[in-house]
């Protein structure tokens, strides 16, 4: 099973290491999740040709997956620490329903999918401690999420495979943008 950050054998062997700062812990957590996503993408791409053909195979994508935009203040131009942090936390909270959908979507990487989901929950907690303006963070409505999950799971096999690919790709992009932004904070 994947080992969460801070619990690997190297850490056990080096008890006198300086404890990680909050920023270092967040950075490490995101990189850990990104490694997990890479493993899941590998299984998805090996199973079908979704990864190469998604552009040609789809005319329209209405999955409302979180995405960084200029107004979110996470890019170098117009960078705004507080606005950006709110966007990162809000986006991760919105991704949670899609990460729930990913459970049971993998055969050989089932534990990896669970690890990505649980590590994201931990990351959200880390980031919430860092945020000053928690009131600005909107939490997704559980009823809406439950309905969304039902609809996603009702799709046929091909659409579910495509949805899985799109979620992993978007989540990877979102985390990479978040990582770059958090390193500026």
């Amino acid at each position: 099973a994947p080992v969460p950050p801070g619990e690997d054998s190297k850490d056990v062997a080096a008890p006198h290491r300086q404890p990680l700062t909050s920023s270092e812990r967040i950075d490490k957590q995101i990189r850990y999740i990104l490694d997990g996503i890479s493993a899941l993408r590998k299984e998805t791409c090996n199973k079908s040709n979704m990864c190469e053909s998604s552009k040609e195979a789809l005319a329209e994508n209405n999955l409302n997956l979180p995405k960084m935009a200029e107004k979110d203040g996470c890019f170098q131009s117009g960078f705004n620490e507080e606005t950006c942090l709110v966007k990162i936390i809000t986006g991760l909270l919105e991704f949670e329903v899609y990460l729930e959908y990913l459970q049971n979507r993998f055969e050989s990487s089932e534990e990896q999918a669970r690890a990505v989901q649980m590590s994201t929950k931990v990351l959200i907690q880390f980031l919430q401690k860092k945020a000053k303006n928690l009131d600005a963070i909107t939490t997704p409505d559980p009823t809406t999420n439950a309905s969304l999950l039902t609809k996603l799971q009702a799709q046929n096999q091909w659409l579910q495979d495509m949805t899985t690919h799109l979620i992993l790709r978007s989540f990877k992009e979102f985390l990479q943008s978040s990582l770059r932004a958090l390193r500026q904070m």
Partner: nanobody
Amino acid sequence: QVQLVESGGGLVQAGGSLRLSCASSGRTFSSYVMGWFRQTPGKEREFVSTINWSGSNGYYADSVKGRFTISRDNAKNTVYLQMNNLKPEDTAVYYCAASAGGFLVPRVGQGYDYWGQGTQVTVSS
């Protein structure tokens, strides 16, 4: 279970027009993405056109762009394919398809859940 019935096929001369219709028996027609595919003997079924739930966006294969127009009437549970300036290479059996996806608009057959029986279109030169 959704049932799809195509009509409007026939024999037409090159340069002529036809309008295909596809009627759906489903009560939730407006929640389906609708598409048209075609197949000629010995060849794989190919994508022709698809339209999203609301009818706001239609998409086309390059070979029919500018000549074919897809539309839908959710009140009548029907999708249409207006085919103008027909060419002999448009000769095929045309199939209507419905995708219950809810989020994605596919251009490939695997993305569709329900299929009609097909209607023959023959374009003579």
